[in-house]
């Protein structure tokens, strides 16, 4: 940007600028061009022997220049234009300034005036243009600083040149008020720092709801002495509610939301949210939506799931398999998991309790993913319940629960009681017993053993009867034991495991039993 | 020295024709804008028309225009004016004049011309 | 066209005397104007151009000045050769028209 502190064309000839010596030499004269009037200041005294004729500007304020720009247009006769070449004459001026506080007025004195250059034209005017009106314009331009008082003069200095000066425009240069990145530049004055740092290093602020972001840089820019904004460094994003329109932040519009400072635009509120009003960071879930903390906002509002489906119990003697099917509705989310739980009551006294700690499940029967689970280590004469509750990344959120219950009934035998018999260096002769009313129930029994320590195998047998010799045994090695009744509806109740151990080859008649 | 002598003056009847002629002699002739002015008896100055150094361009007055052709040759040094259509109020001495710009002192030309030399003058007269 | 008006029409004066003869221009000529004197039955001769510069060759007792639309014709001490009829032409336009004539007479 150009600030202009002197227009002498754009003044049409208003200025009365000081001419000395008074009435000789420069004279302020109107001519057409291009059917336009214009002003200049002339002189063609080419043959009147030596010339000193100066022509100064009016006083003009400095503002905040430090150093000024001085453009000259000006047209230059050719000597040989004249008859004889007129012997005195020249084709160059001189350009002078004087710096000063007060304006002089009419008091003119050459002495306060320090020269800025000799003024050449590129381009003279021969006598062919001349005659056909074809003004060859120069154009120079010449800087003057730093400048220091509050204002200055500029004079020129005839020699003996025909010449017409149509313009003279002083101006300094500034970088102009700037928008970049959402941060707003001041009107800067274009000045070299120094002669090594050509570059004035100007802070950007942040245009209304924008910020700088987190760890980010501030935004700053570069004013060259040229008066152009160079080097952008950092910048400005639109804070949450807003987004960047242009140059500027606008509010979300309503139904739209922004959570945080981005380059992003603002997003339409998503599902089962209520109409969000202007400028909105978040989206308010509808009632009974919810939002996971870690759910991001631009994620739709969910909902707890509802109950898993089809849920039945199939029992097989002790055991009993669960199998259910995905909730209806899964709440709009894809993160459901069930959890089993297990109530165990006594048809005789109707008692009930939780029994968790006495059946054995097939999985961790928390945040299970599959639809199915198998229960085993179930008591005879027991009805039991289980509740299959689906939940996902919002079901923390409610107090309610979605479960479906299945009931069981087990009505296997009990556990036989066992006990050692015999042994031997390499043999355990092992006894068992039922109650008599469910003898009739069992049609074998399965004898599972193995080594203590060694999970790795077993051995069963299967016997009709209530006993059973274990043969082919390591001597003074204890083995773990257990029996099951196998019944027409299954696998009865297992036995608990007992640890029998064979004799040492010293040979010991004590039983572990 | 600048010297200018018209010829081809005489007396016209309205409506007939006549060729001036400027000779020119002890100056550079292509260097001169030429031009022709007229002065009725008794009366002011009036310019009729102008041309260039080396032919163009060529202007003349309102009175005129149509009717009045300004010529020259510069191998011959010779400026024309030829009039057709002549009217009695073109009765007058006609004047051949010339300009250079050499002498005229100034930056920027002036948009039109001043008249720094001049001949005697040849008198037409438009009569029946 | 420009109209040039020039006063007095005629005047009378002595050897001697200061003449200052004006023409006015109907619109503003900056300084594009020339000074001519004719003697009777003689060509016009150039005394100013650019309203104040002396022609070559003319003495310096003619001097011009003025510019806009108001400009005179100074002779400051009239000489017996000076007695003609002076016209102010402007150039300002391609019309160039003359002022009708000042005739300065002996008294």
């Known amino acids: 940007k150009e600030v202009v502190l002197l227009d002498f064309a754009a003044m049409k000839g208003e200025l009365g600028w000081l001419t000395h010596p008074y009435g000789k030499g420069w004279d302020l004269m109107q001519n057409i061009m291009d059917d336009m009037p214009i002003y200049m200041y002339s002189v063609c005294n080419v043959v009147s022997g030596d010339q000193d004729n100066w022509l100064r500007t009016n006083w003009v304020y400095r503002e905040e220049a430090e150093r000024i720009f001085i453009e000259l247009k000006f047209t230059v006769r050719d000597c040989n234009s004249f008859p004889g070449g007129a012997s005195s004459c020249k084709e160059t001026f001189n350009l002078y300034y004087a710096e000063s506080d007060v304006d002089y007025g009419t008091n003119f004195q050459k002495r306060q005036f320090t020269k800025i250059d000799t003024i050449a034209p590129d381009e003279i005017t021969v006598s062919s243009d001349f005659e056909a009106r074809n003004v060859k314009l120069n154009v120079e331009e010449r800087m003057v600083g730093p400048l220091t008082r509050k204002g200055f003069y500029l004079a020129f200095q005839d020699i003996g040149a025909c010449v017409a000066l149509l313009s003279v425009r002083v101006y300094y240069k500034k970088c102009p008020e700037m928008l970049q990145s959402l941060a707003r530049f001041p009107e800067t004055i274009a000045v070299a720092v120094s002669d090594t740092q050509p570059l004035a290093t100007v802070a950007g602020t942040c245009v209304d709801h924008a910020v700088v972001p987190y760890g980010g840089e501030g935004p700053l820019m570069h004013c060259t002495v040229d008066g152009e904004w160079l080097v952008p460094i950092g910048q400005c994003l639109c804070q949450e509610g807003y987004e960047k329109v242009e140059d500027a932040c606008r509010a979300c519009s309503p139904g739209f939301f922004k959570s945080e400072a981005s380059e992003s635009p603002c997003l339409e509120c998503p599902e089962h949210t209520l109409p969000s009003t202007e400028g909105a960071t978040s989206c308010q879930c509808e009632e009974g939506y919810f939002r996971a903390p870690e759910d991001p906002l631009s994620m739709s509002c969910t909902r707890p799931p509802s109950a898993p489906n089809y849920l039945t119990a199939i029992g097989m003697g002790a055991k009993v398999e669960l199998r259910w099917t995905a909730p209806k509705d899964t709440g709009g989310r894809q993160d459901i998991v069930y959890s089993v739980t297990c109530e165990q009551c006594w048809p005789e006294s109707g008692e009930c309790g939780p029994c968790e700690a006495s059946v054995r499940y097939s999985e961790p029967p928390h945040a299970l993913t599959r639809t199915s689970v198998t229960v085993s280590d179930l008591e005879p004469h027991m009805n039991y319940t289980f509740a299959v509750e689906a939940r996902n990344g919002v079901s923390g959120l409610v107090t309610s629960r979605s479960f479906r219950t299945a009931s069981v009934s087990i009505n296997q035998t009990e556990p036989p009681k066992v006990r050692l018999e015999d042994r031997s260096t390499t043999s355990l002769s092992v006894t068992w017993s039922i109650p008599v009313s469910q003898q009739s129930r069992v049609w074998k029994y399965e004898v599972t053993y193995r080594k203590k320590g060694d999970a790795n195998s077993y051995n069963v047998r299967r016997t009709e009867g209530f006993s059973v010799t274990l043969d082919d045994l390591a001597p003074d090695t204890t083995y773990l034991v257990q029996v099951q009744a196998l019944t027409q509806e299954g696998q009865g109740a297992g036995s608990k495991v007992h640890e029998f151990q064979t004799l040492s080859t010293e040979g010991s008649a004590n039983m572990a039993v | 020295e600048v010297q200018l002598l018209e010829s081809g003056g005489g007396l016209v009847q309205p409506g007939g024709s006549l060729r001036l002629s400027c000779a020119a002699s002890g100056f550079t002739f292509s260097h001169y804008m030429m031009a022709w002015v007229r002065q009725a008896p008794g009366k002011g100055l009036e310019w009729v028309s102008r041309i260039g150094p080396s032919g163009g361009p060529t202007h003349y007055a309102d009175s005129v225009k149509g009717r009045f052709t300004i010529s020259r040759d510069n191998s011959k040094n010779t400026l024309y004016l030829q009039m057709n259509s002549l009217r009695a109020e073109d009765t007058a001495v006609y004047y051949c004049?010339?300009?250079?710009?050499?002498?005229?002192?100034?930056?920027?030309?002036?948009?039109?011309?001043?008249?720094?030399?001049w001949g005697q003058g040849t008198l037409v007269t438009v009569s029946s | 066209d420009i109209q040039m008006t020039q006063s007095p029409s005629s005047l009378s004066a002595s050897v001697g005397d200061r003449v200052t003869i004006t023409c006015r221009a109907s619109q503003s000529i900056s300084t594009w104007l020339a000074w001519y004197q004719q003697k009777p039955g003689k060509a016009p001769k150039l005394l100013i151009y650019?309203?104040?510069n002396l022609h070559t060759g003319v003495p310096s007792r003619f001097s011009g000045s003025g510019s806009g639309t108001e400009f005179t014709l100074t002779i400051s001490g009239l000489q017996p050769d000076d007695f003609a009829t002076y016209y102010c032409?402007?150039?300002?336009?391609?019309?160039?028209?003359f002022g009708q004539g000042t005739k300065v007479e002996i008294k």
């Open positions: 004049a010339g300009y250079d710009s050499g002498y005229d002192y100034v930056a920027v030309a002036g948009p039109a011309e001043y008249f720094q030399h």
């Open positions: 032409q402007q150039y300002n336009s391609y019309s160039r028209t």
């Open positions: 650019k309203a104040s």
